[in-house]
Amino acid sequence: QDSRDCARWCPENSSCVNATACRCNPGFSSSSEIFTSPTEICDDINECVPPSKVSCGKSSDCRNTEGSYDCVCNPGYELVSGAKTFKNESENTCQDVDECQQNPRLCKSYGTCVNTLGSFTCQCLPGFKFKPEDPKLCTDVNECTSGQNPCHSSTHCLNNVGSYQCRCRPGWQPIPGSPNGPNNTVCEDVDECSSGLHQCDSSTICFNTVGLYTCRCRPGWEPKHGIPNNQKDTVCKDMHFPTWTPPPGVHSQTLSQFFNKVQDLGRDFKTRSAKVTIQSILKELDELLEAPGDLETLPRFQQHCVATHLLDGLEDVFRGLSKNLSIGLLNFSYPAGTEFSLEVQKQVDRNVTLRQNQATMQLHWNLAQKSGDPGPSVVGLVSVPGMGKLLAEVPLVSEPENQVVRNETHQGLLPILLSDIISAFLSNNDTQNLSSPVTFTFSHRSVIPRQKVLCVFWEHGQNGCGHWATTGCSTMGTRDTSTICRCTHLSSFAVLMAPYDVQEEDPVLT
């Protein structure tokens, strides 16, 4: 058509039919096929909705375009040819896209990609769960802290990445037929001691406890320096014979000879029994006190120091040696009057009484028990009447101000020793403040009528020597030749007669 025959006013998306009429382009429509009105417009026809007969087919969608339409595969699908669009159902080759194969890292760590029609999902591996903030990210489930309590109480739960184990606690083993690890594990205590699975040193004895074991020093052995007892790694040494020599600064041939013999006994101690060693020491002590020799020529105060050193050392040595004794009772006596009584017992809840010729001691067994020591307890008593030779002219120190008892009336007077001197010891060496009192009954020389009788103990002075004192000891009753004393600590004890009569009682001793 000649352009001169074409209407110039035809609207967008139309073309002229002649000089006065127009027609909408394919895919557009107006109120009539050919129109002459300049106000007419051509609207896009939406081929994707009725009454249009366009059908794209399954897994696809119709997409309207300006003046036309396209068929496109649904998300997650694509045409076999790889083309993006098609025109009708006959051209539809839409098929599902396998996103999991296409992108293996689609699901992050510990997740598995599962393809679905048109899409995919991520699934967490067993033992993992989605993080709330990222539904594609799987994180480990801690079964042990999640409150599920998946393990038997005889096991402990071990969380692994993606799983957990129920393993026997240390010192436990699976019951016969039970595995060790899965969630159906059930365990029982291992007796490491009887099964030989312990690692106790040969210097110790294995003690089984629920779930574990400890190693304790053998009787008469002690932990090596700096190593605690009752541990798996406890190592012990043979109970050393305490160092006991003349007190440095005191020079006496008799004393040196006594201590040389004691040192020899100490050296032989490993091969001798403790009982024989105790008897030998007592024999030497009895002979020393029977014939003190040049000890009696020492200054008085040095004699008191020697007595202190002897009493102190006896206690240490006998306490140490008694750890090696078996349960039972020992009684020894010697020509010069030295007596020794000792009882070894397992933990018992009763009183114990040790009887000697001139003295009796009664106390409760629990006083002898050393806290934390499961071994047998020891209660011992030594009577050393001969020690009185070294403890002549000893002052008595009063309680309130720790003053030597000397008032104007009795200036320089000293108390008189009535009884044997006895020394008491326990396996427990913490005896300065006993939880219950110890009762001593002394037989002694007759008391001069109206004289004050005192129960006293030998107090080791700051200078390593000593004096008689009454602190913590009370006189429960006295008859002519016997006195009952009650004390709340242990040491060496005796009964004294005060150097004044009852009428003139010194207030500091009441």
Epitope: P248, D316, Q462, N463
Partner: antibody, heavy 120, light 107 residues
Framework: EVKLVESGGGLVKPGGSLKLSCAAS????????MSWVRQTPEKRLEWVAT????????YYPDSVKGRFTFSRDNARNTLYLQMSSLRSEDTALYYC?????????????WGQGTSVTVSS | DIVMTQSQKFMSTSVGDRIIITCKAS??????VDWYQQKPGQSPKVLIS???NRHTGVPDRFTGSGSGTDFTLTISNVQSEDLADYFC?????????FGGGTKLEIK
């Protein structure tokens, strides 16, 4: 003024002998117990011997017993330590010291020391 | 033998401070323990005897205490001249035994 002066130290071969002396002045020498104490190169103090005031009692640790002899001459106010069968572990600075009255047996005065080296 | 253990080999303190040096005996020695001070290049000098008796001329800032197996030397208001080695000694039994010493350093 109490004074203790040691002498006689020196270099000696293992197995050799040496005699140390300690001259005392300024106190009643014959009334006091005396000791020798040595200080090892590692600065540890070790008691070597003690002699009673009259000289009739001597005491030694096992490490020197039978090898060392401690004596005194109260007329000359002098102590002597005869050392024989010397070993490398005897290398030390040797001090003489005075003991206070028993039972306070502290060593209240010390000399300046004499050095003994046992080496081949 | 009775072993005397001074567990602190070195101790550092400042002038004016208070410091406690300890000594442990392997068996009961009652109170027969002395403390000695040895300043650099000098002989040892007794400070404390019988666990708590201050020797003549020793300043009262030095205090000893203890009985049995555990002993302490306390220096209150430490002075620069207290820089020294400190040794404990037991004379309860032969052999007389010293602790290994504690070196006091002043910051």
């Amino acid at each position: 003024e109490v004074k203790l002066v040691e002498s006689g130290g020196g270099l000696v071969k293992p197995g050799g002998s040496l005699k140390l002396s300690c001259a005392a002045s300024g106190f009643a020498f014959s009334s006091y117990d005396m000791s020798w104490v040595r200080q090892t190169p590692e600065k540890r103090l070790e008691w070597v011997a003690t002699i009673s005031s009259g000289g009739n009692y001597t005491y030694y640790p096992d490490s020197v017993k039978g090898r060392f002899t401690f004596s005194r001459d109260n007329a000359r106010n002098t102590l002597y330590l005869q050392m024989s069968s010397l070993r490398s572990e005897d290398t030390a600075l040797y001090y003489c010291a005075r003991h206070y009255d028993y039972p306070d047996y502290a060593m209240d005065y010390w000399g300046q020391g004499t050095s003994v080296t046992v080496s081949s | 033998d009775i072993v005397m253990t001074q567990s602190q080999k070195f101790m550092s303190t400042s002038v004016g401070d208070r410091i406690i040096i300890t000594c442990k005996a392997s068996q009961n020695v009652r109170t027969t323990v002395d403390w000695y001070q040895q300043k650099p290049g000098q002989s040892p000098k007794v400070l404390i005897s019988l666990a708590s008796n201050r020797h003549t001329g020793v300043p009262d800032r030095f205090t000893g205490s203890g009985s049995g197996t555990d002993f302490t030397l306390t220096i209150s208001n430490v002075q620069s001249e207290d820089l020294a080695d400190y040794f404990c000694l037991q004379h309860r039994n032969y052999p007389l035994t010293f602790g290994g010493g504690t070196k006091l350093e002043i910051k």
